[in-house]
């Protein structure tokens, strides 16, 4: 299962850990997505490595764990973000954060 | 014997198209995924692209990205790169290889297939 | 992307002579790196992943060190085989970037 902080909020110009804890006895995570929207944000795949989008390079670091910090924060950044865990054997698990960027 | 056979190369103008194949032979080529690399005449090693074991998702560097598409046929155990608009700094010679599982690092190469583009 | 920086760019050595390559990242890459060997005219060769594990099949002369930024290959006793360019490879980000090569020449 998947397990998240479903809303979360941060400071315009500061930075926030975007984290989904995937908890099982018996699959393995082969991969995992992080989307705003529909708009892909980063991979991790254990037989890649980490690869951020181009247009997110600058203000998004991968970790802690697989997560993801997403820096200098604009209120465009307001919104949903999704993590996708691909599982062996377990399948693929989705959670889902809203984060909320405030005015500074 | 696992092996790996590129072909397609050749002499090329400037905003032209070209298809590289790779042939595998020697392992379960639908379980890896795949890569390209490239070395310019004298220089360094240059990672192009990879592709999934089923072809789900397909990543590349910067230089070649909205140029070059990776692809791959497992029924054919062969794997692909499409050129197009095509520039003289993708002069190269393009290897095709496969990873250690879980590794990330490259134990198979393919012999090479070079590409020259010019007017 | 991540920058790796190989120093020497070429090394003189002899037979029998201990040679270290060095390879920096310009950022951690944990143990994500790899080291290869190339011949004029041949592909690459995967040595080392992992910073340290030996590839199945190649001579125990061959040892790799480090993690986070900087890392080391050595050669104990160098062989006329070893006569190549060697080149580290860095696998914690996509793309994979190379390093600019070392090259061991025969003293």
């Known amino acids: 299962t998947i397990d998240t902080k479903r809303n979360i909020s941060a400071e315009e110009g500061g930075s926030v850990i975007l984290q989904c804890h995937f908890s099982s006895d018996t699959a393995e995570v082969t991969q995992v997505d992080w989307k705003q929207q529909d708009q892909l944000l980063a991979i991790y795949s254990v037989d890649l490595g980490w690869h951020v989008a181009s247009v997110f390079s600058d203000r998004v670091v991968p970790g802690p764990s697989l997560g993801l910090t997403f820096q200098s924060l604009t209120m465009n950044d307001t919104g949903e973000y999704f993590c996708t865990y691909h599982t062996y054997p377990g399948g693929i698990y989705k959670g889902r954060i809203f984060l909320k960027v405030q005015e500074s | 014997e696992v092996q790996l056979v590129e072909s397609g190369g050749g002499v090329v103008q400037p905003g032209r198209s070209l298809r590289l194949s790779c042939a595998a032979s020697g392992f379960t080529f639908g379980s890896y995924y795949m890569h390209w690399v490239r070395q310019a005449p004298g220089k360094g090693l240059e990672w192009v692209a990879v592709i999934w074991p089923d072809g789900s998702n397909k990543l590349y560097a910067d230089s070649v990205k909205g140029r070059f598409t990776i692809s791959r046929d497992n029924s054919k155990n062969t794997l692909y790169l499409q050129m197009n608009s095509l520039r003289a700094e993708d002069t190269a010679l393009y290897y095709c290889a496969k990873p250690v599982p879980k590794s990330r690092a490259l134990d198979v190469w393919g012999q090479g297939t070079m590409v020259t583009v010019s007017s | 992307d991540i920058q790796l920086t190989q120093s020497p760019s070429s090394v003189s050595a002899s037979v029998g002579d201990r040679v270290t390559i060095t390879c920096r990242a310009s950022q951690g890459i944990s143990s994500w790196l790899a080291w290869y060997q190339q011949k004029p005219g041949k592909a690459p060769k995967l040595l080392i992943y992992g910073a340290s594990s030996l590839q199945s099949g190649v001579p125990s002369r061959f040892s790799g060190s480090g993690s986070g930024t900087d890392f080391t290959l050595t050669i104990s006793s160098l062989q006329p085989e070893d006569f190549a360019t060697y080149y580290c490879?860095?696998?914690?980000?996509?793309?994979?970037?190379f390093g600019g090569g070392t090259k061991v020449e025969i003293k």
């Open positions: 490879q860095q696998a914690f980000y996509l793309p994979w970037t």
